[in-house]
């Protein structure tokens, strides 16, 4: 069986440039170690935004300088991407890999279109 990954079609970042979405996967096996990667696709270019490997039941740990944070609950991963600007608008794809135990499985979501609108600067007050 292939692994199905679901994520919302569209998310709007808040005024502080933070966007959150859930990445849910249907696990064909009993994984104990899972890797989650967020990819950004724009103009046919794909870049890795962030990645984290976690043990089931434990917290996701992204690198210290990562713009992502997240929590896991069962087969759901709640992802938050921070520091987004209008130029970061694009399709954010959730990739899930069941790393252990064998066999390895990979699943890729259809992507979440994240829209980021830069806030208007506050007018000077006299």
């Amino acid at each position: 069986k292939a692994m199905h990954v679901a994520q919302p079609a569209v998310v709007l970042a808040n005024s502080r440039g933070t966007a959150s979405f859930v990445c849910e996967y249907a696990s064909p096996g009993k994984a104990t170690e899972v890797r989650v990667t967020v990819l950004r696709q724009a103009d046919s270019q794909v870049t890795e935004v962030c990645a984290a490997t976690y043990m089931m039941g434990n917290e996701l740990t992204f690198l210290d300088d990562s713009i992502c944070t997240g929590t896991s609950s069962g087969n759901q991963v709640n992802l938050t991407i921070q520091g987004l600007r209008a130029m970061d608008t694009g399709l954010y794809i959730c990739k899930v890999e069941l790393m252990y135990p064998p066999p390895y499985y990979m699943g890729i979501g259809n992507g979440t279109q994240i829209y980021v609108i830069d806030p208007e600067p506050c007018p000077d007050s006299d």
Epitope: A2, M3, E33, L39, K95, P103, Y104, M106, G107, I108
Partner: antibody, heavy 118, light 108 residues
Amino acid sequence: QVQLVESGGGVVQPGRSLRISCAASGFTFSSYGIHWVRQAPGKGLQWVAVIWYDGRNKYYADSVKGRFTISRDNSKNTLYLQMNSLRAEDTAVYYCSRSGSFGAFDIWGQGTMVTVSS
Amino acid sequence: EIVLTQSPGTLSLSPGDRATLSCRASQSGSSSYLAWYQQKPGQAPRLLIYGASSRATGIPDRFSGSGSGTDFTLTISRLEPEDFAVYYCQQYGTSPFTSGPGTKVDIK
């Protein structure tokens, strides 16, 4: 540019050992899984092994399990395949290949020939 | 493991012809994770199609992939001289990663 270059192939007697290498450049090596795929003369492609990211997770084809060991040195951007107890049927061109962002094998080396013969 | 079967074994065509190559999987479920590769004599394989239907970077639009479930197709709309080669399908969604035996496209 993004590339993989294999080395270390040669002629070896049955039962002996050989280690082949794959040097990567042009991309963040530690962010990708890397595979060994082989092709016997005149035959199709056969996946051999993969090693993921930090090197902790490795998978092997049944035909090489217990005889071959895949490893990587992320500080040197290099992949290895240690082949022990070699058999005539291991004779093939060995390719290293990158598991791309979407999983398919998007970058391939030129291959290194391993011949097992007495 | 997922077994992939390709047909025909050899396809004899002329430049300008349309080529249709088939790949069948022994079980469904890996439709999103099927790739096609081209290999010419003495060269490494080259990724053409991933995800059953997405063209890899730099691949001409005469190459297209389709299919789902267990049946997949690679179509070359108009064969160019450089397209005569062996084509392999592969599933990469689960280990062990498996390939078909290949289809050779040669000049009639």
